[in-house]
């Protein structure tokens, strides 16, 4: 026998107290899938939350953070504080990154500086807090009578993966 | 999707070099570190290094300092890892994997792996 | 000390809970990660920076790091979770970048 509540399409619900009817979900929640014997509570974005999607009937609502944070976990279950460029955020708050590391980001720890002699090259423009060591070409490269180098263009560094 | 496919199985003899490729698809490869992990037979992941693909700036664990070299091609978006003077102790299964837009976070993508055999 | 110490094995029956430790100098100033590894197929980032789960991972699967120890929780624990776990650091040292601990296996009994 077919269960009467397979029925109830996303957004309602199947009411037992109304011999199984299928009801629209109430106001301030949703359900996402057909057959619900409940609907679920919409999520609020609260505090440092703000809303980036309304709840629906059929969808939660979608947080994500106010400006000077940045969402964490599935779903942006939390919002850490940003810190500027050049800093990273510690357990303390935040904190300048130390001689030879840099950060780019408003987020993350700082990295160690490339060593351009690894890859048997010669420092091209030197390293800050802010920004990793551009790398020229090899010292060989650089003896007198060499082509000259033009320097690359800036371009857009590694970002801010997408939540 | 993010997808990281990396080229087939590889048998070399000891003192050879192996190339090793990733072709990344589903995001823009210029904006993310991407770095290379390892795992040989029965032992655990070890993290070989990383490069950042816009501005070709390396890093490299202490232990294959002068023997690897990351490097990438980003009209095609692939990144390699070149492994020399191979021993019969770099006999591992090595990975690429992308980390996700900042440094101290996991990474959040992985390649398939590819073997390489190093025998004699 | 770029050393992360685990455990090589826990052993967990069915439903119960299994808690997999790592163990490194003030880790608890660190932000940790962790993989689930099988055999024969690539790493799965389960938690990161101690205690965050990306999308797709169970709620069961959760993280915490204090003091010298970071741990793995996973709670009613179910078959298809046997695999070798492994914590994760990043450092801002040029030489020691990057560093895994040894892994632990989750045996799951019976």
């Known amino acids: 026998l077919q269960d009467p509540c397979s029925n109830c399409p996303a957004g309602t619900f199947c009411d037992n107290n109304r011999n199984q009817i299928c009801s629209p979900c109430p106001p301030n929640s949703f359900s996402s899938a057909g057959g619900q014997r409940t609907c679920d509570i919409c999520r609020q974005c609260k505090g440092v939350f703000r809303t980036r999607k309304e709840c629906s009937s059929t969808s939660n609502a979608e947080c994500d953070c106010t400006p000077g944070f940045h969402c964490l976990g599935a779903g942006c279950s939390m919002c850490e504080q940003d810190c500027k460029q050049g800093q990273e955020l510690t357990k303390k708050g935040c904190k300048d990154c130390c001689f030879g590391t840099f950060n780019d980001q408003k987020r993350g720890i700082c990295r160690p500086w490339t060593n351009c002699s690894l890859d048997g090259k010669s420092v091209l423009v030197n390293g800050t807090k802010e920004r990793d060591v551009v790398c020229g070409p090899s010292p060989a490269d650089l003896s007198p009578g060499a082509s000259s180098v033009t320097p690359p263009a800036p371009a857009r560094e590694p970002g801010h993966s997408p939540q | 999707q993010v997808q990281l496919v990396q080229s087939g199985a590889e048998v070399k003899k000891p003192g050879a070099s192996v190339k090793v490729s990733c072709k990344a698809s589903?995001?823009?490869?210029?904006?993310?570190?991407m770095h290379w992990v390892r795992q040989a037979p029965g032992q655990g992941l070890e993290w070989m290094g990383w490069?950042?693909?816009?501005?070709?700036?390396?890093n490299y664990a202490q232990k294959f300092q002068g023997r690897v070299t990351i490097t990438r091609d980003t009209s095609i978006s692939t990144a390699y890892m070149e492994l020399s003077r191979l021993r019969s102790d770099d006999t591992a299964v090595y990975y690429c994997?992308?980390?996700?837009?900042?440094?101290?976070?996991?990474?959040?993508?992985w390649g398939q792996g590819t073997l390489v055999t190093v025998s004699s | 000390s770029y050393v992360l110490t685990q455990p090589p094995s826990v052993s967990v029956a069915p439903g119960e809970t299994a808690r997999i430790t790592c163990g490194g100098d003030?880790?608890?100033?660190?932000?940790v990660h962790w993989y689930q590894k099988k055999p024969d197929q690539a790493p799965v980032l389960v938690v990161y920076?101690?205690?965050y789960r990306p999308s797709g991972i169970p709620e069961r699967i959760s993280g915490s790091n204090s003091g010298n120890t970071a741990t793995l929780t996973l709670s009613r624990v179910e078959a298809g979770d046997e695999a070798d776990y492994y914590c994760?650091?990043?450092?801002?040292?040029?030489?020691?970048?990057?560093?895994f601990g040894g892994g632990t296996q989750l045996i799951i009994l019976g």
């Open positions: 920076e101690d205690r």
């Open positions: 994760q650091v990043w450092y801002s040292s040029p030489d020691h970048p990057g560093v």
């Open positions: 003030d880790i608890g100033d660190k932000r």
């Open positions: 994997a992308r980390e996700p837009g900042y440094y101290g976070s996991g990474l959040d993508y």
């Open positions: 589903g995001y823009n490869f210029s904006g993310y570190y």
């Open positions: 490069i950042n693909p816009n501005s070709g700036g390396t």
